[in-house]
């Protein structure tokens, strides 16, 4: 017998969670990230929308722009110049695809206290920045590039053949932007502004994605989007510099491709900027297991960029994919030619290389069955970086520092023991020569920002400590979690359960698995998140679970590449195995299990609840990749190589969602999506509802108008009812 | 509330030089970026210079090999050394912080350059 808790007064004024909490974003956290301008020195967006300077060495901070000069242009971001004396405010912000937005510019004279008049920016841009050093201004208008000596002046325009859907200068095409860099911008400043790099994308010859936008008008515009699909045509992008003193001079130099890359489709996947005369291009063949490093340097004689072979760096997996989700970039050291880089080592784990001469000189610096994950700053003396190392947990991220100035080198975890219950999952922002840094925390507790000393890592202040969030939850009940791991035939699953409150061993209850498991992803984090999952474990009683199986990132290769050229199988075997551990544990009410996933997780969603195996009772799928030959190239290619009979055409049939329509039958099915999804889309579930209505299959749908892959507004709040009262009526829950 | 107090303007031949002075009082000094700044008649204020707490310098284009900024954290002091002087070179100086707080300015220190 356990004693009652009827009479406990502060367990009465406990409540669980609503779903009107959950899509109010009233259990919402805040975190803090400086915009660093100097190493002691950042700016930050006051509550009542000032733009203060702070000083972390005075203590001191001062107003360098009112809030009332930002809501005399409506601006809701801006940008100071490295000289100081300018800012841009941007206003009209209109999204555009994932990174992508157009915005109107202002240019704000600090030392006088008014806008720049004359020679004022064309609108809407699509991309603005600032020189590193003093004010030029390089953007981009209608897909040309142009520069501006001075705010003030009139511009200078580098390039004339930009043309929508069709050839783009400095900023990415649709899937350069979604898959490859993945950024807005497509051009670099070289480190004291003398050069600017940019990339030109050709779509001529990509197939075009159309579908309807219905907004008010009497007949539907139709959004084209230039979108390379699996084998299709792809992009053909080159690299140009320009010398930003003299830009009429020569005009733009391309540099030269590697010629083991141009021998057939290639991409472009990053640039990195080492000198103002050194410059390091990365390039990966269309096929993505080979990438090479190139750096290339300026010839003042010829005012060329001479790459030469010997400094080309061959980066090449042979069990799968070049690289985790991306390649890594590389993070150049002090003499400008050598470099550290996050890389398979010999027993298939990603860890910190040094590379001074050839890769396969390349020293390692970390290594351990765990991996490193960023590397955020080199100094002259110091590494600091990211990883999953202690304690064994993947899902967690701590920041070490590395002594790189010593031999042997000393590493020294500065996050591990700093608030060990409620901090394990960190990232970090530096200041210039990693003076200050800032340290922000995401869980598994309430997160918290803060500021520390660069040199003796000692805390100096609280940036955000969500208060605010601290005392509302105060009367909350609050699911449980748990984060363990299931070792099954040599393959370790790591999951996370989330419990009602009161939960009970000894009872049965509703198990909901929730899924992304594409590849190089991870859903089990020790991050804090108050989200509908919450809700549904705090107030409907539910289990959920999410697990990470194969193909899934930062347990070393074995695990990730396991699904190379073979999507949706082991994913949704790992899955099912899980359900049934979790069935095993003795508390799951088995004839009540469910399934859901977004996206890549709506495919895997799908696919588990058309296995055969009767475990699922229902599921839902949003916005699913129902067929690989349907989503774009640079992903899909790199997991599963080309949709072609000579390589892997077969299993891009045979994992399609419709091959499946016939096993829907015995399971109750949700399909939702968006019908001006970009991304994955709407033809991925019409392709879906057309198999099922064929098979004769009963199902239910939802369309959202006009909405994109991220179901956002007004579309968010029906979306989590709708699938609310589906789970509810599939788990017997009264309303 | 601070205090900037710029000194040693004048009237100097072209070719000729000068040495500008800023002392600040009422905060701390030596961690903050400082800059110099000029306004020629009927027109806007532009930056000149500035030097970081690191004492890593910026130049205008206009004044980059003639001037150099210098800082001494130990009398709360700014200094602008202006060599080769233009009669472009006329305006009143002004020292900040940079960037400058909103709306405040010292009174400045007239350098006039003849010809």
């Known amino acids: 017998l356990r004693p009652s808790r009827v009479h406990n007064s502060e367990e009465n004024t406990m409540r669980a969670l609503t779903l009107k909490d959950i899509l109010n974003g009233t259990f919402s956290y805040k975190t803090f990230f400086p915009n660093w301008i100097s190493g002691q020195e950042y700016l930050h967006q006051s509550a009542d929308n000032n733009i203060v300077l702070y000083n972390i060495e005075t203590g001191q901070s001062y107003t360098i722009l009112s809030n009332r000069t930002m809501k005399s242009v409506n601006a809701s971001n801006y940008g100071l110049s490295p000289d100081r004396q300018f800012v841009y405010l941007e206003s009209d912000y209109s999204k555009l695809w994932r990174y992508s937005y157009t915005a109107t510019y202002y240019i704000y004279d600090l030392s006088n206290g008014e806008f720049v008049r004359g020679n004022e920016l064309p609108r809407p841009i699509q991309y603005l920045c600032w020189s590193p050093v003093g004010s030029k201004l390089a953007y981009v208008y209608q897909n040309n590039i142009y520069l501006k000596q001075r705010p003030g002046d009139p511009p200078f325009q580098i390039t004339f053949n930009g043309r929508e859907n069709k050839i783009f200068n400095g900023i990415p095409d649709w899937v350069y932007e979604e898959e490859m860099l993945p950024t807005k911008y497509a051009l670099w400043w070289s480190p004291n502004g003398k050069f600017l790099a940019y990339a030109e994308f050709n779509d001529k010859d990509i197939p075009v994605i159309a579908y309807s936008y219905y907004g008010d008008e009497q007949y539907p515009r139709t959004i084209n989007i230039p979108y390379p699909k699996a084998g299709a045509k792809n992009p053909v992008v080159r690299i140009f510099i320009i010398d930003t003193t003299y830009p009429a001079y020569v005009g733009p130099q391309e540099v030269p491709v590697p010629a083991m890359i141009a021998s057939s489709d290639y991409y472009f996947s990053w640039l990195t900027w080492v000198t103002d005369e050194r410059v390091c291009l990365q390039w990966l063949k269309r096929v993505q297991n080979v990438s090479v490093l190139s750096i290339c340097d300026f010839r003042e004689d010829w005012q060329t960029w001479d790459c030469p072979k010997t400094q080309e760096h061959i980066e090449e997996s042979r069990t799968g994919w070049a690289g985790g989700f991306f390649v890594s970039r590389p993070v150049f050291s002090y003499d400008a030619i050598s470099y550290y880089k996050i890389f398979s080592d010999k027993d298939g784990y990603k860890h910190i290389h040094y590379i001074k001469d050839t890769v396969e000189n390349a020293i390692q610096i970390t290594s351990g069955k765990w991996e490193a994950i960023n590397i955020f700053r080199v100094t002259q003396d110091s590494l600091f970086y990211s990883s999953n190392e202690f304690e064994e947990y993947p899902g967690r991220r701590n920041i070490y520092r590395i002594s790189i100035g010593s031999y042997p080198p000393s590493k020294k975890c500065v996050t591990c023991h700093l608030r060990k219950e409620r901090c394990q999952y960190y990232t970090a922002s530096f200041s210039d020569y990693a003076k200050y840094y800032a340290l922000v925390c995401y869980g598994p507790g309430i997160p918290i920002s803060t500021l520390h000393d660069g040199r003796t890592d000692q805390e100096i202040k609280i940036l955000e400590e969500n208060k605010e969030l601290e005392n509302a939850l105060k009367n909350i009940q609050l699911p449980k979690e748990e984060i363990k791991k299931l070792e099954v035939d040599e393959i370790t699953l790591w999951y996370k359960m989330i419990l009602p409150p009161q939960f009970d061993r000894s009872k049965k209850y509703p198990l909901l698995i929730q899924v992304y498991g594409g590849p190089c992803s991870q859903s089990v984090r020790s991050v804090f998140a108050v989200n509908w999952i919450s809700y549904l474990a705090s107030k409907e009683g539910m289990v959920i679970a999410l697990v990470d199986g194969r193909g899934t990132a930062f347990q070393g290769d074995k695990l990730l590449y396991a699904v190379y050229r073979k999507l949706g199988v082991y994913e949704v075997e790992d899955q099912i195995t899980a359900v049934r551990k979790f069935i095993e544990m003795g508390f799951i009410d088995e004839k009540r299990i469910a399934i859901w996933g977004w996206s890549y997780g709506g495919y895997v969603s799908s696919l588990a609840l058309a296995s055969g195996t009767g475990l699922f009772k229902c599921g839902i799928a949003v916005a699913p990749v129902s067929s690989w030959e349907y989503y774009a190239s640079v992903y899909t290619e790199r997991f599963m190589g080309l949709p072609t009979k000579d390589d892997n055409l077969e299993h891009y049939k045979n994992s399609t969602v419709m091959a499946r329509a016939e096993y829907f039958r015995n399971v109750d099915y949700l399909l939702i999506h968006g019908t001006a999804d970009d991304n994955v889309h709407f033809q991925n579930s019409a392709q879906i509802a057309k198999a099922l209505v064929n098979a004769q299959v009963d199902f239910q749908a939802m369309w959202y108008s006009d909405q994109n892959h991220g179901l956002s507004g007004l579309s968010t709040n029906h979306l989590y009812t709708h699938m609310t009262h589906f789970l509810k009526q599939c788990f017997s829950l009264s309303d | 509330q601070v205090q900037l107090q710029e000194s040693g303007g004048g009237l100097v031949q072209a070719g000729g030089s000068l040495r500008l002075s800023c002392a600040v009082s009422g905060r701390l000094f030596s961690a903050n970026t400082m800059g110099w700044y000029r306004q020629a008649p009927g027109k806007r204020r532009e930056l000149v210079a500035t030097?970081?707490?690191?004492?890593?310098?910026n130049y205008a284009d206009s004044v980059k090999g003639r001037f150099t900024i210098s800082r001494d954290d130990g009398k709360n002091t700014v200094y602008l050394q202006m060599n080769s002087l233009k009669p472009d070179d006329t305006a009143v100086y002004y020292c900040n912080f940079a960037p400058p707080p909103e709306g405040y300015w010292g009174q400045g220190t007239q350098v006039t350059v003849s010809s």
């Open positions: 030097i970081l707490s690191s004492g890593s310098t």
